[in-house]
Interface confidence: low
């Protein structure tokens, strides 16, 4: 027989299929061009030493071969005495190791049977009513088709869907969508309404995120404030990645879930603007303020839940800084200013209280005083830090308050407001003689200690009413109690007790008056 | 020749361990999912464990999570079964078989191995 | 119990045509392909029809099977005393992540 016909002769092996698992698969046959045809099939197992015969048998039951040798594609012309026009089954049979491997029969139409191709390029991706829909352009010259799917996850095997027929320039099928896994599809193409017409190859794998996106599990840490006022939010955990099924794995395309960082700065509620998304991937840089953070997840159809956290403001106060001088008019702060034209936030709030009953002040761009500073004033009238109570300040400042994540932390502190030099003063003090020449003198607390920081000292005065001596002693914020010596029996004395703050003397306590007793010896 | 031939079972008292091994050859094994598939005397197949092409992934019958761990090793074309706190009921022949790569069906399947649990 | 539902025998003289149905629910025969194995005297089971009707190589046109539903059926055409053999029918369940087998169904041919 000649190569290039179809030998009509018994084949050079003997006839028998050894059912092994192995073997040709996948036959496909096609018209190439106007009098060429081309079949191809796949072998599964060790390729070494194997010989295909590509086998037909005619409507007439006659039957022939053509050696194809090693290959697993095989062309011939429609001169080779296959029948083209009419019905022809077709096979492939492997010779390998002594034994006959078959491959299943396709019977068809030679010359109406076409080489159709799977979607190629873009395939487009949407979601309709809980279904997946997927588009993409009918190959060229091939309009008219029967289109099929299989889709797997990560955990399940192939399972083959029909898109039904299509006979337009686009074609599209409605898929079942997963509500928490991805899925790889794969389409694949065969001829329309020709009878045992071959299927095309698989297309490349469509990758298709789950309905929701994952619920990003993240964990935060947020660095130590640093000299400049601001701190970095770190991530101390990625969010799981998405479990691909094998052909997404590494490229997915159309898989990936973009995290994104919602940010709320909840301090200084006065400002532009409170809120900002960034990129998970660009951690920011914070104020020492309290900030709601998110963590949005979201894929090619839509967001998903989010992961919320809390960070508390950084309660760090510096023994700084904070001058308040407290007029007729009024009462001015001053700090060291940060740089040229900033704008600064100014807020407090009763210490102990929710941090919803925060106020704020925003200042116009200041340029720093010829002393460095920076100032805020407010008037009596206008109640702010008005009641005798304790404050927690803190001032921030921005070059571009506009931009969240550039707000830095001037300082924290605390502040007594109100009339502080008077409702400092402490109360209940007691004298008690302690020895022939001392006393001891103790005293409530003064109000100014429920404030940290905003206690200096306190200082105890001993006025000698003959001399009219005074003697004054300081003593540390944290004592209530202190022993006066060196006095003089029969002598008058009185004691006044104050308290102190950084930038205000308090108002002396009521004087005490006392007097040691002289001792008669018998 | 595409093949499959489990190993390890034997004879073993209640509530210890055994671990069966399958060895694969004349396919990329690195490609199929595998399943552990037993068959206890007279009776019908039950289905015990599978696990996903690189092991990423692994799923077992009520009747033995928790006791049994399906494991293996592309580079030595291997599937193992960790059997531990074995009982009476264990008592089968056990079946590799090789998933298909198109579809969910076993298609090569091994000779099987007995174990026996026994006092 | 068996997740999928076979009858336990069936009986036929040779030549003669039997079925051996499988009924499960949506969330395996409803939703995946069926598979049929084999399984003669003293061997292991083999492949004997995979995505619900399609035979593999070596497996003689005598097999067939077909899904409607959540059942699926084997039927096979001009008995063989090699018939003789427990034929099980099996699926995926996408809801327990299993696979699940029928109990099994004896051939005996008369």
């Known amino acids: 027989c000649r190569t290039s016909e179809c030998c009509f002769q018994d084949p050079p092996y003997p006839d028998a299929d050894s059912g092994s698992a192995s073997g040709p698969r996948d036959l496909r046959c096609y018209r190439i061009s106007s009098d060429r045809y081309e079949c191809s099939w796949q072998y599964e197992g060790p390729t070494a030493g194997v010989s295909h015969f590509l086998r037909c048998c005619l409507s007439s039951g006659r039957c022939c071969y053509f050696a194809a040798g090693s290959a697993t594609r095989l062309q011939f012309s429609d001169q080779a005495g296959v029948s083209v026009l009419y019905t022809v089954t077709l096979w492939v049979e492997s010779w390998a190791r002594n034994q006959t491997e078959k491959s299943p029969e396709v019977t068809l139409q030679l010359y109406n049977s076409v080489k159709y191709e799977p979607p190629l390029g873009d395939i487009k991706v949407s979601k309709l009513a809980g279904q997946l829909r997927m588009e993409w352009e009918t190959p060229d010259n091939q309009v008219g088709a029967e289109v099929q799917f299989r889709h797997r996850t990560p955990s399940s095997p192939w399972k083959l869907g029909d898109c039904g027929p299509q006979d337009d320039d686009t074609e599209s099928c409605l898929c079942p969508l997963e509500m928490n896994v991805a899925q790889e599809f794969q389409l694949r193409r065969r001829q329309l309404g020709s009878q045992g017409s071959s299927w095309s190859k698989w297309s490349s794998p469509v990758c298709v995120p789950p309905e929701n996106p994952p619920q990003p599990q993240v964990r935060f840490s947020v660095e130590q404030l640093g000299q400049d006022g601001r701190r970095r939010l770190t991530l101390k955990e990625q969010p799981t990645q998405l479990e691909l099924p094998e052909g997404c794995q590494g490229l997915a395309p159309g898989t990936e879930v973009t995290y994104r960082l919602q940010l709320h700065m909840l301090s200084c509620p006065c400002k532009a603007k409170a809120t900002r998304t960034l990129h998970l991937g660009k951690m920011p840089y914070l104020s020492g303020a309290a900030y709601n953070v998110a963590v949005i997840s979201s894929n090619q159809f839509g967001p998903g839940l989010n992961q919320t956290w809390h960070i508390p403001a950084d309660t760090h106060t510096e023994p700084v800084a904070l001058n308040i001088s407290v007029g007729t008019n009024g009462t001015t702060m001053y700090w060291p200013a940060r740089a040229q034209s900033m704008t600064y936030c100014i807020e407090w709030q009763p210490v102990g209280q929710d941090g919803g009953l925060a106020t704020c002040s925003l200042t116009a761009p200041q340029d720093p005083d010829p002393a460095g500073m920076a100032t805020y004033s407010w008037s009596r009238e206008s109640g702010a830090m008005g009641q005798e109570k304790c404050y927690y300040i803190t001032i921030f400042a921005s070059a571009h308050p506009e931009k969240l994540t550039l707000w830095s932390t001037v300082l924290s502190t605390y502040h007594f407001g109100g009339n502080a030099s008077a409702a400092g003063t402490p109360h209940h003090v007691s004298v008690k003689n302690h020895s022939l020449d001392s006393v001891s003198v103790d005293w409530a607390p003064s109000l100014l200690s429920t404030c940290p920081g905003v206690l200096k000292e306190y200082v105890v005065r001993c006025r000698d009413e003959d001399s009219k001596q005074v003697s004054e002693h300081p003593v540390q914020p944290t004592e209530t109690q202190v022993t006066l010596s060196g006095l003089r029996a029969g002598v008058a004395y009185t004691v006044q007790v104050r308290a102190d703050t950084a930038w205000l003397r308090g108002v002396w306590s009521q004087p005490q008056r006392f007097s040691i007793e002289v001792q008669v010896s018998d | 020749q595409v093949q499959l031939v489990e190993s390890g079972g034997g004879v073993v008292q209640p509530g210890r361990s055994l671990r069966l091994s399958c060895a694969a050859s004349g396919f990329t094994f690195s490609s199929h999912g595998m399943h552990w598939v037993r068959q206890a005397p007279g009776k019908g197949l039950e289905w015990v464990a599978i696990?996903?092409?690189?092991?990423?992934?692994?799923y077992y019958a009520d009747s033995v999570k928790g006791r049994f761990t399906i494991s293996r090793d592309n580079s030595k074309n291997t599937l193992y079964l960790q059997m531990n706190s074995l009982r009476a009921e264990d008592t089968a022949v056990y079946y590799c078989a090789r998933e298909s790569l198109l579809n969910s069906a076993s298609d090569i399947w091994g000779q099987g191995t007995m174990v026996t649990v026994s006092s | 119990q068996s997740v999928l539902t076979q009858p336990p025998s069936v009986s036929a003289a040779p030549g003669q045509t039997v079925t051996i149905s499988c009924s499960g629910s949506?969330?395996?025969?409803?939703?995946?392909?069926v598979s049929w194995y084999q399984q003669l005297p003293g061997t292991a089971p083999k492949l004997l029809i995979y995505?619900?009707?399609k035979r593999p190589s070596g497996i003689p046109d005598r097999f067939s099977g077909s899904k409607s539903g959540t059942s699926a059926t084997l039927g096979i055409t001009g008995l063989q005393t090699g018939d003789e053999a427990d034929y099980y029918c099996?699926?995926?369940?996408?809801?327990?992540?299993?696979?699940?087998f029928g109990g099994g169904t004896k051939l005996t041919v008369l």
């Open positions: 949506s969330s395996n025969i409803g939703n995946n392909y």
């Open positions: 099996g699926t995926w369940d996408s809801s327990l992540s299993a696979v699940v």
């Open positions: 995505d619900n009707n």
């Open positions: 696990i996903w092409y690189a092991g990423n992934k692994k």
